[in-house]
Amino acid sequence: QRFAQAQQQLPLESLGWDVAELQLNHTGPQQDPRLYWQGGPALGRSFLHGPELDKGQLRIHRDGIYMVHIQVTLAICSSTTASRHHPTTLAVGICSPASRSISLLRLSFHQGCTIASQRLTPLARGDTLCTNLTGTLLPSRNTDETFFGVQWVRP
Amino acid sequence: QRFAQAQQQLPLESLGWDVAELQLNHTGPQQDPRLYWQGGPALGRSFLHGPELDKGQLRIHRDGIYMVHIQVTLAICSSTTASRHHPTTLAVGICSPASRSISLLRLSFHQGCTIASQRLTPLARGDTLCTNLTGTLLPSRNTDETFFGVQWVRP
Amino acid sequence: QRFAQAQQQLPLESLGWDVAELQLNHTGPQQDPRLYWQGGPALGRSFLHGPELDKGQLRIHRDGIYMVHIQVTLAICSSTTASRHHPTTLAVGICSPASRSISLLRLSFHQGCTIASQRLTPLARGDTLCTNLTGTLLPSRNTDETFFGVQWVRP
């Protein structure tokens, strides 16, 4: 009763259902605002089916429209902490190839300690997505508090 | 022009497109932090196509990767109210079977009155999802303010 | 390796994968709380595949269950600004036909400057979705800060 069976055993890859859900690995060095991600069943509930990680950044393998979603929670944070360290901002964008560089999704924390959002966007094979966190508060590495994922929706 | 027609009339069940959107029924008794959900066309715009409710908790009927989403709004809430009450936190997790118990998604309200997020996660047939609300502010039962749903994405 | 190829070249329209992602065009005149949207590749990364715009409002062309998502960021906003101009509320609903008018999704900004959420909801051909922003703060027109979209999920 699997979808693949209903498709005369066509491999899922041919259906274009690329999907990935990543957990935070680490933050970048001093001048690098990027978050570095990791994924795979050995790590818990994260996975990559189609997209790949390139030095902690997510690289797309199939053209299409994708749902991109993210949640980032700041560690050891309260509304007081957040407002005292303002501004903390998260931006998700295409960072390579340089010719396609663009910000896709941007949120500020203001007096909150978590941001979460999602959007539909066209992505092309080879696009690498970067998530830039500016500010002086560390993101939580708890897998239920900070995560980043994409889901292929249609060509 | 329906998808099912394009699939030589294969029933949607065989495509694996399980989906549910629930509305809040009630909160639990004193020592039970769980929210209890309800769904069905008679209740408004909530529905269950595949998953089922087991004593107000959502039970998965098909293995796969799911998009889980939730929004909870606190009733009679302002940023002042929120800051004057015990930290209110919402966690979505697998609560049974016990061997698979894990927190999938966690958010604190801080000085806000609404949390909303979503994530991709693998779920297995028989997994029951619980939504635990800790804190002393009641969640709104308005169907446009508090809701919880899952969508099967791929095997 | 496209999905359409796996489906014996059936046009995507027959699969029912209607999808749209819109960017803010402008706000309404004085007594009109609606946001007016625009979409299309010439504008950037917004698009309409199936749904259409009717005077800046999104009209559905295919019955089904949809994932509706939105993010709105207030322009020139800080937590102080937001609390001083409270309440600012965003509501997404079916505004026509009048017989189906209902609020689907509602969020208040409280001390924050961005709201983002998503939900599953049944929509019918001809339903027009309106996004009402009440309050005295302008929404940002930056395409990575304010956007609105729908994705057909199943019949």
């Epitope: - | 809040l24 909160t27 008794p29 004193q30 709004t73 009733a75 009679i76 800051s83 004057r84 009450h85 015990h86 930290p87 002393t136 502010l137 009641l138 709104s140 039962r141 308005n142 303010e145 | -």
Partner: antibody, heavy 119, light 111 residues
């Protein structure tokens, strides 16, 4: 078992202040707001305000705003209600109360403290 | 402030008979899917005891002869079969907004 134990009866002169204590036990003190409600002899109940022990933030009924102060001592799980510029109409039983799960209704009450204001 | 008006002021009912107490709010206390109306029983020399919360929910340990109903501005507390131990003063209270206010009380006695 949740318990709220209040300090003993007080007799005060008009213009003086009174400070009533309420010691909570049987639950995590910093979790639940504690409210104060008073009842004049033979009269009904009147909500005075509440305090969140987690950070000490208090909210007062406008009627008492200029005269009431609510504080807490987390080390002893005790909250205090001080009422100043006492007048004879402040003669009442003063109750502290808290709730069992959600705020807004009171499942647990102290035994009450009678404050008599008389010259 | 929301004004709570209870009626009647006093009520004499035979043992085993039904007692009904009404409470009217000066404006609606219902929002967000709840009615923020609660009922208490108070006996002489004792603090109030919670009977009903959110208009119709029976507090743990309270006999099921007590029930609450209503929404918006009009609410009712019903004792289906009055017992001797039910002699007391009954108060309604709203928590729709600050300040919370109570009704003036209804004294229930045995006829």
């Amino acid at each position: 078992e949740v318990q709220m134990v209040q300090s003993g009866a007080e007799v005060k002169k008009p213009g003086a202040s009174v400070k009533v204590s309420c010691k909570a036990s049987g639950y995590t003190f910093t979790t639940y707001n504690i409210h104060w409600v008073r009842q004049a002899p033979g009269q009904g109940l009147e909500w005075m305000g509440d305090i969140y022990p987690g950070n000490g933030d208090a909210s007062y009924n406008q009627k008492f705003r200029d005269r009431v102060t609510m504080t807490r001592d987390t080390s002893t799980s005790t909250v205090y209600m001080e009422l100043s510029s006492l007048r004879s109409e402040d003669t009442a039983v003063y109750y502290c109360a808290t709730f069992s799960r959600f705020d807004g209704w009171f499942a647990y009450w102290g035994q009450g403290t009678l404050v008599t204001v008389s010259s | 402030d929301i004004v709570m008006t209870q009626s009647p002021d006093s009520l004499a009912v035979s043992l085993g008979e039904r007692a009904t107490i009404n409470c009217r709010a000066s404006r609606s206390v219902s929002t967000s899917g709840y009615s923020y109306m609660h009922w208490y029983q108070q006996k002489p020399g004792q603090p109030p005891k919670l009977l009903i919360y959110l208009a119709s929910n029976l507090e743990s340990g309270v006999p099921d002869r007590f029930s609450g109903s209503g929404s918006g501005t009009d609410f009712t507390l019903t004792i289906s079969s009055l017992q001797a131990e039910d002699v007391a003063v009954y108060y309604c209270q709203h928590s729709r907004e600050l300040p919370y206010t109570f009704g003036g009380g209804t004294k229930v006695e045995i006829k």
